[in-house]
């Protein structure tokens, strides 16, 4: 059988290294050798490249080496496949070396900010040594912030043949570390060089970008003052490296700026004690270069009715995220504040918050939350300066079996009945939503019985027991991950009811 006709011929010119062609099929059923016929020097010269007859593996590739590679040039390439039965020739293919030239990557030697020019980095590189000296090179510059996985790209060409080349990358974030990598190709070529080694540079610092501001309203104290916990953080989109020297806070009752009070702090939280009226609070951050724009918050009067628009909320888990979605009856509300913190018996140590815009869902990576911990999640609608009624839910990113079972006791022991009471497992030991309790009980040397009840039941009366019999009993609390038994208790049913016994006694 004749060999298959060589097809899909693809050639690439590795500048000053080789000219390599590949084709299909890569393997033949019977032993096949190949001859690649080339015309070059614009068709004046011709030669061949043979695959090694001793190579019995994949040899659907052949390379022409210097000094017979000249550039610029046009080549024709034809592949002949030969086996014991004969020869099969490919079609003749035509190659312009400029269009298939691949050169070495450039070498970036500096990425620096230019004094006084904001949000710009100047990249300097050395044009590859192995590149045609007179040709225009096209470049792709890839860049990303150091903590991002997402690359951005900019394309440009350089016509000069200067060995030391530069490009000014503008519209960057202030005071941010960027990773840069560069590739190049002759302007007409379809093949790019590899990427250069990555280089890091930092844009110049500026006055702070801005703040996100939030509050927790606490119950009024006996003297009528209201504690308001203010908290702020760098606004979303602010440079990662941005450092504030401090924060200025000023606040006053609505329509009464004469009563303005000011505070300076280096913390990112501050507790204010306000009266019952509506207050306005303003916060700016500052560094050596200036102040951020003002962050504003309206604190409603104590008796103000807040609007309610969230109708329902669901928390669901994906592979690696917790997603909270909500439904709203107010289409005009498009900003929401999400609060989340662990539901613990003591005061929560970590309280987090985040603004959501133009969406009715909020997503957090599972690994940002602790497994086996219950989180309280509240969503507040925000309409201009008004904050509405929150809607809250609870969620676990991962449930486990409880760390301890319920503490149980037997009350009201009768002849054939007993009332079992157990305590809720402390929040810190639940490790998931308790979905039910199961009471396991067994007479001495008897069969074990069980009864499962809802999680809101903490007491159960067992009936149809055998009189004057010792029983062992334990209660298991279950989450979606499984159950944990509480301590085993023992009790013995009475031989005669107390009621009957007393009656008898009187006679």
């Amino acid at each position: 059988v004749l060999p298959a006709k060589p097809e899909n011929i693809s050639c690439i010119f590795y500048y000053e290294e080789n000219f390599t062609c590949t084709w299909s099929p890569e393997k033949e059923a019977s032993y096949t050798w190949y001859k690649v016929k080339r015309t070059y020097s614009y068709g004046y010269k011709s030669d061949i490249c043979s695959t090694d007859n001793s190579t019995r593996g994949n040899h659907a590739s052949c390379s022409f080496l210097p000094p017979t590679i000249t550039n610029p040039d046009n080549y024709t390439i034809q592949v002949e496949a030969q086996n014991a039965d004969g020869i099969m020739k490919s079609d003749i293919t035509y190659w312009n070396l400029d269009a298939i030239m691949k050169i070495e990557p450039p070498e970036i030697f500096s990425v620096k900010s230019v004094l006084g020019i904001k949000r710009m980095l100047q990249i300097k590189w050395i044009r590859p040594v192995l590149a045609p000296h007179s040709s225009t090179l096209k470049y792709t510059l890839r860049f990303r912030t150091i903590n991002s996985a997402y690359w951005m790209e900019v394309n440009f060409t350089k016509e000069d043949i200067d060995r030391d080349e530069t490009y000014n990358l503008t519209e960057l974030q202030a005071f941010t570390e960027y990773v840069m990598t560069l590739r190049c190709a002759p302007a007409e070529s379809m093949f790019w060089s590899g990427w250069s080694q990555e280089k890091v540079g930092t844009t110049e610092e500026e006055a702070p970008y801005g703040l996100d501001l939030w509050r927790v309203l606490k119950p009024a104290m006996v003297d009528g003052r209201r504690p308001v916990q203010l908290m702020w953080k760098k606004a979303t989109g602010a440079p990662v490296l941005e450092k504030a020297l401090g924060y200025n806070i000023w606040y006053f009752p609505e329509n009464n700026t004469n009563l303005t009070e000011t505070v300076n702090t280096t913390n990112q939280t501050h507790e204010l004690y306000l009266g019952g009226k509506t207050y306005w609070v303003y916060v700016v951050s500052y560094n050596s270069l200036g102040e951020s724009p003002v962050a504003t918050l309206r604190i409603p009067a104590l008796n103000e009715k807040t609007f309610q628009c969230i109708e329902a909320m669901q928390a669901c888990l994906t592979q690696d995220q917790l997603v909270v979605e909500w439904q709203s009856s107010a289409p005009e509300v498009d900003t929401w504040m999400v609060e989340w913190f662990p539901d613990v018996d003591s005061e929560p140590s970590s309280f987090s918050w985040e603004s959501v815009s133009q969406a009715r869902n909020w997503t957090i990576q599972k690994d940002e939350l602790k497994p086996l911990w219950c989180y309280n999640i509240s969503v507040y609608p925000v309409l201009r300066d008004r904050v509405g009624q929150p809607y809250s839910t609870q969620a676990y990113v991962q449930e486990g079996i409880p760390s301890a079972g319920p503490v149980t006791q037997a009350d009201s022991i009768g002849v054939k009945t007993v009332t079992i009471t157990w305590k809720e497992i402390p929040k810190s030991k639940r490790n998931g939503f308790i979905k039910n309790y199961t009471i396991f009980y067994q007479a001495e040397d008897g069969k074990e019985f069980s009864k499962t009840v809802n999680s809101n039941i903490l007491q159960y009366r067992l009936e149809s027991l055998t009189r004057r019999t010792s029983y062992s009993l334990q209660v298991m609390a279950s989450t979606n991950a499984g159950g944990t038994n509480g301590t085993k208790i023992n009790f013995k049913t009475l031989s005669i009811s107390h009621h009957h016994h007393h009656h008898h006694h009187h006679h």
């Epitope: 001859k35 016929k37 015309t39 020097s41 614009y42 068709g43 004046y44 010269k45 011709s46 030669d47 061949i48 046009n74 024709t76 034809q78 002949e80 020739k89 003749i92």
Partner: antibody
């Protein structure tokens, strides 16, 4: 339409010089190697000389090396053959031809050069 | 330096098939493309086969080219001979060692 038109032939005495020209049209002259091929009366074709696209590389048959010079003017789309120290055996019809893919795809009509005293 | 050897003459009757061989003296015939030219008396040559077996679009499909490694030669085959096929035929290849084109001595085809 590709056209190659030779000029400059005629009768010349042995030892003297002559310059042939070939004016090309209908294609991008600077993209092709060009050649001169001759044919002595009643004899076969004999390649004489070739020149690269930019004129930097030239090739000659041994019998004309040092006597003939091939050159080109890409701006004028013209090929030249300067023939010095002409001999009787140089008598032939000289064809201007275009190289491509290892062969000559277009030929001029030819110009006769007679070297005789 | 190799030579290409052709028979001085070949003849064939009208509408028959003839083959003109072209033998390479040294080196592999398959290492460099072979082309063929037809030359009528007093006219410049025209190319009828290039790259061993490729035919220019304006040339009749009665003309075909091939190479045979066992005899280290190329062949031009003309089928259904016509009177107008009477001409001189030259093979040509390239000598990569000395970087020059090489012509065969030519074959005179007579149509009987």
């Amino acid at each position: 339409e590709v056209q190659l038109v030779e000029s400059g032939g005629g009768l010349v005495q042995p030892g003297r010089s002559m310059k042939l020209s070939c004016t090309a049209s209908g294609f991008t002259f600077s993209n092709y190697y060009m050649a001169w091929v001759r044919q002595a009366p009643t004899k076969g074709l004999e390649w004489v000389a070739s020149i690269s696209t930019g004129g930097g590389n030239t090739y000659y048959r041994d019998s004309v090396k040092g006597r003939f010079t091939i050159s080109r003017d890409n701006a004028k789309s013209t090929l030249y053959l300067q023939m010095d120290s002409l001999r009787a055996e140089d008598t032939a019809t000289y064809y201007c031809a275009r190289h491509t893919m290892g062969y000559f795809d277009y030929w001029g009509q030819g110009v006769m050069v007679t070297v005789s005293s | 330096q190799f030579t290409l050897t052709q028979p001085k003459s070949v003849s064939g009757s009208l509408r028959s098939t003839i083959t003109i061989p072209c033998e390479r003296s040294s080196g592999d015939i398959g290492d460099n493309y072979v082309s063929w030219y037809q030359q009528h008396l007093g006219r410049p040559p025209i190319n009828v086969i290039y790259a061993d077996d490729q035919r220019p679009s304006e040339v009749s499909d009665r003309f075909s080219g091939s190479i045979d490694s066992s005899s280290n030669s190329a062949s031009l085959t003309i089928t259904n001979l016509q009177m107008d096929d009477e001409a001189d035929y030259f093979c040509q290849s390239y000598d990569g060692k000395i970087e020059i084109p090489v012509f065969g001595g030519g074959t005179k085809l007579t149509v009987l």
